[in-house]
């Protein structure tokens, strides 16, 4: 807390200029009017000041606006942004997503802070949902956004908004979130061709279920390994050998590397060796032949 | 450029443990397997176990029955590799080896880890 | 597990000269399954043939490998002074992976 002091003589702030950057904290405290600082947002980023002169600043601004900061002040806050805290944004309605773009610019580069997760928390909640517009930004400053979402929270994305998304912008994402964004992927994608359609919703795949594996596996998709592997085992597990041959195509022959991997084990696990025998692989681990395989899961089912 | 950059050097004493992380840049993670593969004092190479980045899922060299755990960090792009009751005979250099999912040879080496264990 | 077993131990050649070195399985490795690596002093491995036969990306020409089932070769052609270092194989046809304990080709 800065002591109150009167403003020496000649030293009162007309505008927010380089000048100020020679006050020391008290002056800076006595002598900048918080309304001309608030009118004058843009220029702070301009100016040198040092951390301990940005606290009076921010200080000034803070009485100014017990309630919370208008938008036009937010959106000028440049550096000062890194100053503010969680509960300091909180008290913020964000409706502009140039404002936003503005504030997360002041964090490029750097992990997502609490400041900035409370920002956007506030900025989604504000909006309602989660719009193409906003995860286009979001996701270019932090590709690994969606994926911080809970699948509550990605249930409000709208499938026109699954365009914006890139496959790196969901590589953290586990089963659970991809189980809610594939059937919106899905939808968003239903009316492009099948080649097209597979480069899209490839990044989605661990979420499909079983009867869209099969349907996939009929069209000349040649899924990679990597795609393959990121699949739900439950999903897998009932396809034959001809659908995960039809599946991969030429690149079938790399369940070899990674039978020793979920799903890939567990799927060979299921399989009989005569029907493995027949990739040529040397996969091992199938049902020998002359046993009887019973679907006690089938039979609890009946019963 | 694609890189995998190791940890320092480490000494250690016998029953304690070490953890050397591998951090990659310049490629898409999840795509590749991370393997690990030592290699003893004026000695051959030796696998030691592989990860999948994408789901975490591990596959380890029976020899090293429960002592190797590896683990990834997606956020950073690094793998980690623990050996625990380390002996002196786990005394060598461990390379992490890039392997593209789906193929069984490593394209791309770390630097090496010196791993000494002495009392 | 399966074990290779690389000969000679060590090979003593001249710049120019052709190098052949072997590989052998203690049982069948798929061909797909087999690589070859180079190793100098103090530097980490580098892959040099992937699938028995295929080249890797920026190896020279002059390197070559060829073998089915038990029996493999990795060849150079003429030897580069760059060449003369420590080379092992390695399968992944048969789990624990394996690598062969080397062979060494040093300046005559």
């Known amino acids: 807390e800065v002591e109150k002091t009167a403003c020496p003589s000649g030293k009162k702030a007309r505008e927010i200029d380089e000048s100020l950057i020679f006050y020391k904290k008290w002056e800076l405290e006595a002598c900048v009017d918080a309304a001309l600082l608030a009118t004058q947002m843009d220029r702070v980023n301009a100016i040198p000041f040092t951390y301990e002169q940005l606290d009076v600043l921010k200080h000034k601004l803070d009485e100014l606006y017990p309630q919370g900061y208008p938008e036009s002040v937010i959106q000028h806050l440049g550096y000062l942004f890194l100053k503010m805290s969680p509960e300091d944004i909180r008290k913020w309605n964000v409706t502009s997503l140039e404002t936003l773009k503005a504030l997360l610019e002041v964090n490029k580069g750097h992990e997502m802070s609490p400041q900035v997760a409370t920002l956007i928390d506030r900025f989604v909640k504000g909006r309602g949902q989660l719009d193409k517009d906003t995860l286009d930004t979001l996701t270019a400053f932090y590709p690994g956004y969606l994926c911080s979402l809970s699948p509550e929270e990605l249930s409000s994305v709208p499938p026109s908004s699954i365009w914006a998304v890139r496959p790196q912008d969901l590589d953290t994402c586990d089963p659970r979130q991809l189980d809610v964004l594939y059937p919106k992927a899905r939808l968003a994608f239903q009316n492009m061709n099948g080649s097209e359609y597979f480069v899209k919703i490839q990044s989605f795949l661990g979420g499909a279920p079983t009867e869209d594996l099969k349907a996939l596996s009929q069209q000349n998709v040649s899924m990679d390994l990597a795609t393959f592997m990121k699949l739900r085992t439950d999903a897998v597990l009932p396809l034959t050998v001809a659908e995960v041959q039809k599946l991969l195509g030429p690149h079938v022959e790399g369940l070899k590397a990674e039978e020793r991997h979920r799903p890939v084990r567990d799927w060979i696990l299921r399989q009989r060796q005569d029907d493995l025998d027949t990739l040529g692989l040397g996969l091992q681990g199938g049902i020998p032949n002359g046993y009887l395989v019973l679907d006690l899961s089938m039979q609890e089912a009946l019963s | 450029e694609v890189q995998l950059v190791q940890s320092g050097a480490e000494v250690k004493k016998p029953g304690a443990s070490v953890k050397v992380s591998c951090k990659a840049s310049g490629y898409t993670f999840t795509d590749y397997n991370m393997d690990w593969v030592r290699q003893a004092p004026g000695q051959g190479l030796e696998w030691m176990g592989d990860?999948?980045?994408?789901?975490?899922?591990?596959i380890y060299n029976q020899k090293f029955n429960g002592r190797v755990t590896m683990t990834e960090d997606k956020s950073t792009s690094t793998v980690y590799m623990e050996l625990s009751s380390l002996r002196s005979e786990d005394t060598a250099v461990y390379y992490c080896?890039?392997?593209?999912?789906?193929?069984?040879?490593?394209?791309?080496w770390g630097q090496g880890t010196t791993v000494t264990v002495s009392s | 597990e399966i074990v290779l077993t690389q000969s000679p131990a060590t090979l003593s050649l001249s710049p120019g000269e052709r190098a052949t070195l072997s590989c052998s399985a203690s049982?069948?490795?798929?061909?797909?399954?087999l690589s070859w690596y180079q190793q100098k002093p103090g530097s980490s491995p580098r892959l040099l043939i992937y699938r028995t036969s295929n080249l890797a990306s920026g190896i020279p020409a002059r390197f070559s490998g060829s073998g089915s089932g038990t029996d493999y070769t990795l060849t150079i052609s003429s030897l580069e002074p760059e060449d003369f270092a420590v080379y092992y194989c390695h399968q992944w046809s048969s789990f624990p992976y394996t690598f062969g304990g080397g062979t060494k080709v040093e300046i005559k």
């Open positions: 080896a890039r392997r593209r999912i789906g193929t069984g040879y490593f394209d791309v």
């Open positions: 049982s069948s490795v798929i061909s797909s399954y």
């Open positions: 990860i999948n980045p994408s789901t975490g899922g591990t």
